[in-house]
């Protein structure tokens, strides 16, 4: 069974998948479609790296540009380094600028909805 066939079989169970499962899935060459990706739990998507999302979505990663104003895509973009976003070749903006550190202050983020940044 190839990755695409595997994805079709598990698609209906993915809604509540935790980050760890999504990271594992990104190694399976599943090419998740964007509609399914956007139904995932936001808290499960946010920790994924650009490389992991790229592997998870495969060719459908191109659609992030078309859906950049919608959650969880918008929130995920805000969490990524701009340099990493640039590798997607989509002109996505809003990532963390080069030279900034991301502080994992859970309370701060819970209140504001965005990560706390420490400038250069």
């Amino acid at each position: 069974m190839n990755g695409s066939e595997y994805f079709v079989k598990i698609q209906s169970f993915l809604g509540g998948a935790p980050t760890e499962d999504l990271k594992a899935l990104s190694q399976q060459n599943v090419s998740m479609d964007l509609a399914t990706f956007m139904k995932l739990r936001t808290d499960a998507v946010l920790p994924l790296t650009v490389a992991e999302v790229q592997k998870l979505l495969g060719p459908h990663v191109e659609g992030l540009k078309a859906e950049e104003r919608h959650r969880p895509v918008r929130d995920w973009i805000l969490r990524q380094r701009q340099d990493d976003l640039d590798t997607l070749g989509l002109g996505l903006q809003g990532g963390i600028p080069n030279g900034y550190l991301v502080l994992d202050l859970s309370m701060q983020e819970a209140l504001s909805g965005t990560p706390c940044l420490l400038g250069p």
């Epitope: 090419s31 964007l34 191109e62 659609g63 859906e67 070749g89 989509l90 002109g91």
Partner: antibody, heavy 117, light 113 residues
Framework: EVQLVQSGAEVKKPGASVKVSCKAS????????MHWVRQAPGQGLEWMGN????????YYNERFMSRVTMTVDKSTSTVYMELSSLRSEDTAVYYC??????????WGQGTLVTVSS | DIVMTQSPDSLAVSLGERATINCKSS????????????LAWYQQKPGQSPKLLIY???TRESGVPDRFSGSGSGTDFTLTISSLQAEDVAVYYC?????????FGGGTKVEIK
């Protein structure tokens, strides 16, 4: 103004390979994916695959998986599509098309590839 | 693969009259989160490259005359030319960009009656 200029028509023998180029201008080349679509004479459109011009990552329609290779040259803002093991049914016009998000917003003029012995 | 079925194959309409083209997909093209339908319409005039008319099923590409409109959701979509002009003679294709391989309908040829 966005422009996609493709290489000229080619005549190839069965079993040979063809490499079609698509030179882009008028926009930031690395910000938009490129797709390849072909159209056999008098027929409809068939998606072959797409390529990320920033990283060079490419994805192919499984129908062409073993025969197609898409590459990019960022220095010249050019994308290439090579199709190998040509057969008569590969005779078609091959188009490059720049993505607009997912849809194909701008198309090249097309390159006619004729496969004939 | 998602199968796109267009109807009719060809259509002859008088100048100034309405032309309606249908497109049906074998599975939903709706993103239920964003409410976007991943469907585009293209126009291909004789001897020319295809040209984008509509994306997200109903969003008109800039520069496209407002006599062209798209509608529908899920699996059933329609392209309407409200008042056919001579320059609208072409083949029209729908395309799904929901899941690869992105697939096109077989095309609808629009002619003047």
């Amino acid at each position: 103004e966005v422009q996609l200029v493709q290489s000229g028509a080619e005549v190839k023998k069965p079993g040979a390979s063809v490499k079609v180029s698509c030179k882009a201008s008028g926009y930031t080349f690395t910000n938009y994916w490129m797709h390849w679509v072909r159209q056999a004479p008098g027929q409809g459109l068939e998606w072959m695959g797409n390529i990320n011009p920033s990283s060079g990552d490419s994805y192919y329609n499984e129908r062409f998986m073993s025969r197609v290779t898409m590459t990019v040259d960022k220095s010249t803002s050019t994308v290439y599509m090579e199709l190998s093991s040509l057969r008569s049914e590969d005779t078609a016009v091959y188009y490059c098309a720049r993505s607009g998000g997912l849809w194909l917003a701008f198309w090249g003029q097309g390159t006619l590839v004729t496969v004939s012995s | 693969d998602i199968v796109m079925t267009q109807s009719p194959d060809s259509l002859a309409v008088s100048l100034g009259e309405r032309a309606t083209i249908n497109c049906k997909s074998s599975q939903t093209l709706l993103n239920s989160v964003s409410q976007n339908n991943y469907l585009a319409w293209y126009q291909q005039k004789p001897g020319q490259s295809p040209k984008l008319l509509i994306y997200f099923a109903s969003t008109r590409e800039s520069g496209v005359p407002d006599r062209f409109s798209g509608s529908g959701s899920g699996t059933d979509f329609t392209l309407t030319i409200s008042s056919l002009q001579a320059e609208d003679v072409a083949v029209y294709y729908c395309q799904q960009h929901y899941r690869t391989p992105y697939t096109f309908g077989g095309g609808t040829k629009v002619e003047i009656k």
